[in-house]
């Protein structure tokens, strides 16, 4: 039966379907053709090495000619599967998860230093020291290799689920600019959530103009509260609050705002160095040093969920925290405010003062 729509046509994983006047077609990568990208132009059945000339095997797989269409067979590298080695292999049993190769890493876990040699999944991203204390950002992701692919700027469909942190939006960006146009960026930060709609800033990569263009759209809050500990004192952070919110909204591709307490005050609290239980007398006499801010944020997905590709919104605060932890772990968190840690917390009614 001839496929009449993209729903009926099975394109290989990672290959988009296009509706054309002559019916649906897979947008084949170079060197592949046919309705389902299974054949090679000009390759007769049983062709020799021509079928491998287009290097159809991905991720280090080796290609061998084959007598039947698509006239090649891929021998995939470890961790990859699929006709063209395009998909990460299913996660093996937990026992096969790579162990932490360095004995020294056990002692370095949680010491507030991101130790490069311990920054791997087997070592728990140095016990969270490299992942903003979220532990393993990919702990819910079943495809084993997704942490490797997170930073490769290519769409890896098996990693594009919420649990796998949307493959760092690689499948969603689709060639569009991934960051706010530098020409607009300063303007958008200065005019973020100022009550005026600036259409040039009303894009996900510029933070949706702080919802200035969405006053008619009802709020759609993600579950929970995103809690950030920022190593800037509250007065300094609040001085640049629009810039802070705009940049974070742009990173998470949704809208963020400070959670307000019962008095309408932004929930930004001084962060004092946490002290261990048994503290010497001299220590208790020290005035507590304010070394940062604890910031409580709400995630409003109203525009994220309205956008054409609305399958990339963070459903809860913890998944947004995991995404920030993942960016930190791969050293790609372009955010000019130094974060100590991030976490998602269940939503409770706002109180006048939140004990920390």
């Amino acid at each position: 039966r001839v496929a009449r729509s993209c729903r009926e046509l099975q394109c290989p994983v990672g290959v988009p379907c296009q509706q054309t006047p002559r019916g649906p077609r897979c947008a084949c990568p170079p060197g592949l053709s046919g309705p389902s990208c299974r054949s090679f132009p000009g390759s007769p059945p049983g062709a020799s090495n021509a079928s491998c000339a287009a290097a159809p095997c991905l991720h280090g797989g080796s290609c061998r000619p084959a007598p039947l269409a698509p006239f090649f067979r891929c021998a995939c590298a470890q961790g990859w599967t699929g006709p063209r080695c395009e998909a990460p292999a299913a996660a093996p049993e937990v026992s096969e998860e790579p162990r932490c190769p360095r004995a020294a890493c056990q002692a370095k876990r949680g010491d507030q230093r991101c130790d490069r040699e311990c920054n791997s999944p087997g070592c728990g991203w140095d016990g969270g020291d490299c992942s903003l204390s979220v532990g393993d950002p990919w702990r819910q992701c079943e495809a084993l290799q997704c942490w490797r692919l997170f930073n490769n700027s290519r769409c890896d469909p098996a990693c594009s689920s919420p649990a796998c942190l949307y493959d760092n939006f690689d499948c969603h960006a689709g060639g569009r600019e991934r960051t706010c146009n530098p020409v607009y960026e300063k303007y958008c930060a200065d005019h973020f959530a100022d009550g005026r709609c600036d259409q040039g800033c009303n894009t996900e990569e510029c933070g949706w103009d702080g919802l200035d263009c969405a006053s008619e759209v009802p709020a759609l809050l993600a579950r929970g509260v995103l809690v950030l500990t920022v190593l800037l004192p509250p007065e300094e952070l609040l001085r640049s609050s629009a810039d802070f919110l705009q940049r974070l909204s742009a990173i998470l591709r949704t809208s963020l705002r400070f959670r307000l307490d019962a008095h309408g005050q932004a929930m930004v609290f001084p962060y004092h160095r946490p002290s261990p239980g048994s503290e010497p007398r001299a220590r208790r006499e020290l005035a507590p040093e304010v070394i940062g801010s604890v910031v409580m944020l709400e995630i409003d997905n109203r525009l994220c969920l309205q956008s054409p590709e609305n399958d990339h919104c963070f459903p809860d605060a913890q998944s947004a925290a995991d995404y920030l932890g993942a960016l930190s772990a791969v050293e790609r968190l372009d955010f000019p405010y130094p974060l100590r840690d991030v976490r998602g917390e269940p939503l409770e009614p706002p109180e006048p003062s939140v004990p920390l």
């Epitope: 002692a107 370095k108 010491d111 507030q112 230093r113 991101c114 130790d115 490069r116 020291d129 190593l231 160095r273 002290s275 261990p276 503290e279 220590r283 020290l286 040093e289 070394i291 050293e331 790609r332 968190l333 372009d334 955010f335 000019p336 405010y337 130094p338 100590r340």
Partner: antibody, heavy 119, light 107 residues
Framework: QVKLLQSGAALVKPGASVKMSCKAS????????VTWVKQSHGKSLEWIGE????????NFNEKFKGKATLTVDKSTSTAYMELSRLTSEDSAIYYC????????????WGQGTLVTVSS | DIQMTQSPSSLSASVGDRVTITCKAS??????IAWYQQKPGKAPKLLIY???NRYTGVPSRFSGSGYGTDFTLTISSLQPEDFATYYC?????????FGGGTKVEIK
């Protein structure tokens, strides 16, 4: 307020060792890493290594492994650095600093200890 | 290990001049850069941390920018007390390397 007070200048012979101290006050000593930095005359700053007073864990610049030994005495809030097998190359000012949480910028510095290696 | 290369190694400028010092990392370091000022016979002083945040008490004429591998310290209007040597430093991962320094002298 936060203070780091270092021991006085030392004149030592080649091949000998020297141990300098850095006494911290004005903050909870075990909460911050103590870092040591070398500055030879007219030269740039070199990161030697750091120690966590809480765990005793250390990180070193490869260049100073085997040269510098870092220790702490929590009871007196004092960090120590011992330099061994001294040569003229080790003549320098040595600073101790407080490494800030997670990122390790240095907002507080000791006044420095001048070590001169000469026969 | 990641190298931090500062340029120029020295420069001459007059009071009121705008001065720009650059620091290049041999690999991506994100925002993980600090800048220090050092005067002869004194310990260094922290000016900027995490690429662009001015430390408490540092005058607003000092600003930092950059991300990844290329960073800049700018003094918008040089004052007499700003003649000193400036260092960049890599943060977050050890080794916490310093740049070679830039000496700002009076023209």
């Amino acid at each position: 307020q936060v203070k780091l007070l270092q021991s006085g200048a030392a004149l030592v012979k080649p091949g000998a060792s020297v141990k300098m101290s850095c006494k911290a006050s004005g903050y909870a000593f075990t909460d911050y890493w103590v870092t040591w930095v070398k500055q030879s005359h007219g030269k740039s700053l070199e990161w030697i290594g750091e120690i966590s007073p809480n765990s005793g864990g250390t990180n070193f610049n490869e260049k100073f492994k085997g040269k510098a030994t870092l220790t702490v005495d929590k009871s007196t809030s004092t960090a120590y650095m011992e330099l061994s097998r001294l040569t003229s190359e080790d003549s320098a000012i040595y600073y101790c600093t407080r490494g800030e949480i997670r990122y390790n910028w240095f907002a507080y510095w000791g006044q420095g200890t001048l070590v001169t290696v000469s026969s | 290990d990641i190298q931090m290369t500062q340029s120029p190694s020295s420069l001459s400028a007059s009071v009121g001049d705008r001065v720009t010092i650059t620091c290049k990392a041999s690999q991506n370091v994100g925002n993980n850069i600090a800048w220090y000022q050092q005067k002869p016979g004194k310990a260094p002083k922290l000016l900027i941390y995490y690429a662009s945040n001015r430390y408490t008490g540092v005058p607003s004429r000092f600003s930092g920018s950059g991300y990844g591998t290329d960073f800049t310290l700018t003094i918008s209007s040089l004052q007499p007390e700003d003649f000193a040597t400036y260092y960049c430093q890599r943060l977050y991962n050890s080794p916490f390397t310093f740049g070679g320094g830039t000496k700002v002298e009076i023209k």
